[in-house]
Every structure is written in structure tokens, then in C-alpha cells.
Interface confidence: medium
């Protein structure tokens, strides 16, 4: 898939919240359109619109426990996984085999993490060790990002390790499932 690799642990532990700059508020003016739940209005014609906020992401709510070594959070945290395409349906069918047809010069709209939030969690450790408090960075919302067919993985590197899934070594298209997913269960997932 060509995603950047990242450390295979449960989440990114943040020493200090202030170390992470706020992502740019690119779609702040039309955030409600940027959600699959809200069924964002499709454009009049594919790729004629310049307002990416008209495309909505598929935001999957997951819950998981935060782990740090052998320690695990007392309660699960809730975050989003940003997944797949978020533009109009493809204009061309797949080629035979695993390859994809690319629109000759058309953009590819991918769903990637937009805003993050910090949450303090209490980590419980085995062997009677004292509980530890940590701040974790969680995906709070997703957005569409317009990529061209020639964009490579560097296009996703601005969005932190949650923005891309582990390497799979196939298909040249960047995939942005986004946040590392989660465990337990979301009480109000929908």
C-alpha cells in the first residue's frame, strides 16, 4: 500500500500536550458536511467542485484501551478511524487483477485525520506498581484531503503516525484509515 510504517503499539503517549501544534482549520467553516453520518451533499458533477468540504468522510467510532508496555488504561478511550475514499464514486471500473484504474489526471480524495484531542488516562500496571497518568493524542475528526495520482506517502506524513496504516507493500494508492483503532466497546457508537 505504501504507507509509512509506525511503531506497533497501542497508541502514542504524549509527554506534554503543548508539543503538538493544532492542525490547520481547513474545513472549520463546514465541519458538519465533513462527516459520513451527515450524508454530505454530493457535488453537482464529479470533480467540478473546488469545495472539498462537500465531500464527507466515513468516520468509524471505535473504543480501545491505551497500553504502555504492560500497563493498560483503567477505562477505554473513544476515537475515530478515518477510512477510505471520500469523493464521488469512481468514474471507471477496476482493471483486471488487483490494479486500480486511475482517473487520467483527476484527484483522489482520501479520508484522513483532521483534528486531534488530548485525553488524560490512568494506566494500571501489573505487579502492584503504582498507577501512572498519561496524556494520549486521539483522533477527534476526519477530513477529506485532495491528492493527485502522483502524490506519494509524504502527502500523509503531516498528519502524524495515526494518519496511515502499516506497510503492506502493494497498491500505489495512499490509504488513510487514520487512527490506530481500539478495544472494548463504545457505549454510544451510534
Amino acid at each position: 500500500q505504501g504507507w509509512q510504517a509506525f511503531k506497533n503499539d497501542a497508541t502514542e503517549i504524549i509527554p506534554e500536550l503543548g508539543e503538538y501544534p493544532e492542525p490547520p482549520p481547513e474545513l472549520e467553516n463546514n465541519k458538519t458536511m465533513n462527516r459520513a453520518e451527515n450524508g454530505g451533499r454530493p457535488p453537482h458533477h464529479p470533480f467540478e467542485t473546488k469545495d472539498v468540504s462537500e465531500y464527507s468522510c466515513r468516520e468509524l467510532h471505535f473504543t480501545r484501551y491505551v497500553t504502555d508496555g504492560q500497563c493498560r488504561s483503567a477505562k477505554p478511550v473513544t476515537e475515530l478511524v478515518c477510512s477510505g475514499q471520500c469523493g464521488p464514486a469512481r468514474l471507471l471500473p477496476n482493471a483486471i487483477g488487483r490494479g486500480k484504474w486511475w482517473r487520467p489526471s483527476g484527484p483522489d480524495f482520501r479520508c484522513i485525520p483532521d483534528r486531534y484531542r488530548a485525553q488524560r488516562v490512568q494506566l494500571l500496571c501489573p505487579g502492584g506498581a503504582a498507577p501512572r497518568a498519561r496524556k494520549v493524542r486521539l483522533v477527534a475528526s476526519c477530513k477529506c484531503k485532495r491528492l493527485t495520482r502522483f502524490h506519494n506517502q509524504s502527502e500523509l506524513k503531516d498528519f502524524g503516525p495515526e494518519a496511515a496504516r502499516p506497510q503492506k507493500g502493494r497498491k500505489p494508492r495512499p490509504r488513510a484509515r487514520g487512527a490506530k483503532a481500539n478495544q472494548a466497546e463504545l457505549e454510544n457508537a451510534y
Partner: antibody, heavy 118, light 107 residues
Framework: QVQLVQSGAEVKKPGSSVKVSCKAS????????LNWVRQAPGQGLEWMGT????????TYSQKFKGRVTITADKSTSTAYMELSSLRSEDTAVYYC???????????WGQGTTVTVSS | DIQMTQSPSSLSASVGDRVTITCSAS??????LNWYQQKPGKAPKLLIY???SLHSGVPSRFSGSGSGTDFTLTISSLQPEDFATYYC?????????FGGGTKVEIK
């Protein structure tokens, strides 16, 4: 090639639990969501829940919440679906299905028939 | 939950016929719609994803269209192996939901 191989048929008593396994091969197990879908005799398809084995994230259909538990064993690339407090209406074929990047279930297990009968 | 309604629930057709199956969502789902084919005693098979993208190995006689709430699966020229039940599925919002199915039978 990608394969999802499920455990064999089960006959269970009402009130008991069943645990169905789904062994994945031919792809990196932790890279994909794995869903569970069931189909009662002569009926349509019903989504139960999904797991992201990369770190065991789960989400379930409200209908089964509290009765279903989906887990994954990364060391054996196997996902499990446990359904408790079985009743006769849980008699169905249970499928596991891999989810690709745009939400499509591109590979399915062969199905496991669970019969709940007293 | 988003309800997915397929029509017709069954249809009879002959080899070579053009067959159209519709799927209606109870609320807008943009293009987050997949189509599956299922034969008796077998697991479903993916045909179309993201409304109109053909899955690998699926013949080009299958096509999908639509957006928002109304979607269509078309088989341009029905073949003997196409007699089966077809399901639509939305994945815009949890829980993922399927249509009730359309059984395509031999006339």
C-alpha cells in the same frame, strides 16, 4: 491467496454460548478490519460487529451489544466471535468477512452453521 | 439505523436479458454502497463497491450507479451463472446494514 477458514458447525442449547473461529491467511492479518455477519435460514444478511486486529478495536451492532464478543489472536491470525445467551432465533450461518479500505467485504469465510435447539 | 430497501424482492429473467435491481436507503449515504451476489449454500461474493467500482475478477456486465439514497445494480446481459440473490449494503453509518435481497430466477 487470501483465505478465511471458519470452524465447523455447532449445535447448542438455549442459554448457552458459542464461539466461532475464523483463521485468516494470505494477507497481513492486522491490516484489515474483520467483520462478522450472520444469515438466518431463508433470511438476509445481518451485520454483527467488527474488529481491527492491529490493536483489537471493536464495534458492535446495538442489537447484539452485551451478547457478542469479537476477539483476535494476532499470533495465529485468527478472529473469534462469541455469542452468549443463545436462543432459537440465533440459529443461522455465521460468516467472517475481511473489510477492504473503502468499506467493502471483499473476502468471506465459508460460513459456520450454528443451530440452537433444546 | 439506516434501512436499505431492495426492489424487486424477486424477478424472473432469461439469459441475455438486461436486469436492473434498485436499492433505496432511508437516509443519504453518499456513495457508501456495496453490492454482493450469493448463491444457495455459499458465502456472499463482492461485486461492486463504493457504488460503481467493479471488484477484481467481476465481469464487466455488472455495473452500479447512484448516490445519496437511490442506487442501481445492472446486469447488461444475464448469464446462466448470474442466477442468484443480490444484496446491497451501506457502510456510511454504523451499524452496517444490508438490503433484504433480490432473487434473480430463471424464467
Amino acid at each position: 491467496q487470501v483465505q478465511l477458514v471458519q470452524s465447523g458447525a455447532e449445535v447448542k442449547k438455549p442459554g448457552s454460548s458459542v464461539k466461532v473461529s475464523c483463521k485468516a491467511s494470505g494477507y497481513t492479518f492486522t491490516d484489515y478490519f474483520l467483520n462478522w455477519v450472520r444469515q438466518a435460514p431463508g433470511q438476509g444478511l445481518e451485520w454483527m460487529g467488527t474488529i481491527y486486529p492491529y490493536h483489537d478495536g471493536t464495534t458492535y451492532s446495538q442489537k447484539f451489544k452485551g451478547r457478542v464478543t469479537i476477539t483476535a489472536d494476532k499470533s495465529t491470525s485468527t478472529a473469534y466471535m462469541e455469542l452468549s445467551s443463545l436462543r432459537s432465533e440465533d440459529t443461522a450461518v455465521y460468516y467472517c468477512a475481511r473489510e477492504e479500505e473503502d468499506g467493502q467485504f471483499d473476502y468471506w469465510g465459508q460460513g459456520t452453521t450454528v443451530t440452537v435447539s433444546s | 439505523d439506516i434501512q436499505m430497501t431492495q426492489s424487486p424482492s424477486s424477478l424472473s429473467a432469461s439469459v441475455g436479458d438486461r436486469v436492473t435491481i434498485t436499492c433505496s436507503a432511508s437516509q443519504g449515504i453518499q456513495w457508501y454502497l456495496n453490492w454482493y451476489q450469493q448463491k444457495p449454500g455459499k458465502a456472499p461474493k463482492l461485486l461492486i463497491y463504493y457504488t460503481s467500482s467493479l471488484h477484481s475478477g467481476v465481469p464487466s456486465r455488472f455495473s452500479g450507479s447512484g448516490s445519496g439514497t437511490d442506487f442501481t445494480l445492472t446486469i447488461s446481459s444475464l448469464q446462466p451463472e448470474d442466477f442468484a440473490t443480490y444484496y446491497c449494503q451501506q457502510h456510511s453509518k454504523l451499524p452496517r446494514t444490508f438490503g433484504g435481497g433480490t432473487k434473480v430466477e430463471i424464467k
